[in-house]
């Protein structure tokens, strides 16, 4: 019986150029965590295995770099970077446990206007 | 469930190439990252290459220049060119593949020896 709870982030946003941690924190559950696969949508990021340690798909391997813990912190943020994420925790004996999380990447200007525009 | 079976390994002398190559089967949609490891007797197993659906490729610093690694994503087989092989070589080169939403699964290794 799969007893955990995935804590995440949740929805966040972020200036483009600059970086965000993404982060997932599994509870209430004493299954093993063997494996953390970090994916956007339909590509895969990283993964940090038990046994091995992070591995960054070659084709972030310039702009992600692993932790802080199982977290993934994703740099130099295009607005393509926009959408979904997910954290997804390899566990034994309970088996799979998935999180979500969605950042917004927003040009400067517009983060700087919604600042200075907000209504109290 | 993933299924990983490489192939290739053998016997080549120092100087030579040998070509491995990793089938995998079942599950295996979505993107990947697909790599080779290897384990010389006496050693603890080590990376060697991977790379992911969208070409991009990562080495060990002792292999850069002479191991190539490659991919055909229309039959989910990794190859994994090795030119001017070295005794230092020489191990069981296994094959490591993750699928989207998948764990980490491993190829049952193929035996490559490098000796005059």
């Known amino acids: 019986m799969m007893t955990g709870t995935i804590e995440t982030t949740g929805n966040i946003s972020a200036e483009k150029g600059g970086s965000i941690i993404l982060q997932c924190h599994l509870s209430s559950t004493t299954a093993q965590v063997t494996q953390v696969n970090w994916e956007q949508q339909d590509q895969l990021l990283a993964i940090c295995n038990a046994d091995l340690g992070w591995h960054i798909s070659p084709s972030f391997k310039d702009r992600v770099a692993p932790g802080p813990g199982l977290g993934l912190t994703l740099q130099s943020l295009t607005v393509n970077d926009t959408g979904e994420y997910f954290c997804i925790y390899h566990t034994y004996p309970d088996g799979t446990y998935t999180g979500r999380i969605f950042l917004e990447v927003l040009e400067s200007s517009v983060a700087e206007h919604g600042a200075r525009f907000q209504i109290p | 469930e993933v299924q990983l079976v490489e192939s290739g390994g053998g016997l080549v002398q120092p100087g030579g190439s040998l070509r491995l190559s990793c089938a995998a089967s079942g599950r295996t949609f979505g993107d990947y990252i697909m790599g080779w490891f290897r384990q010389a007797p006496g050693k603890e197993r080590e990376f060697v290459a991977t790379i992911s659906r969208g070409g991009g490729s990562t080495y060990v610093d002792s292999v850069k220049g002479r191991f190539t690694i490659s991919a055909d994503n229309s039959k989910n087989t990794a190859y994994l060119q090795m030119n001017s092989l070295k005794p230092e070589d020489t191990a069981v080169y296994y094959c490591?593949?993750?699928?989207?939403?998948?764990?980490?699964?491993w190829g049952q290794g193929t035996l490559v020896t490098v000796s005059s």
């Open positions: 490591a593949a993750v699928f989207s939403r998948g764990p980490l699964t």
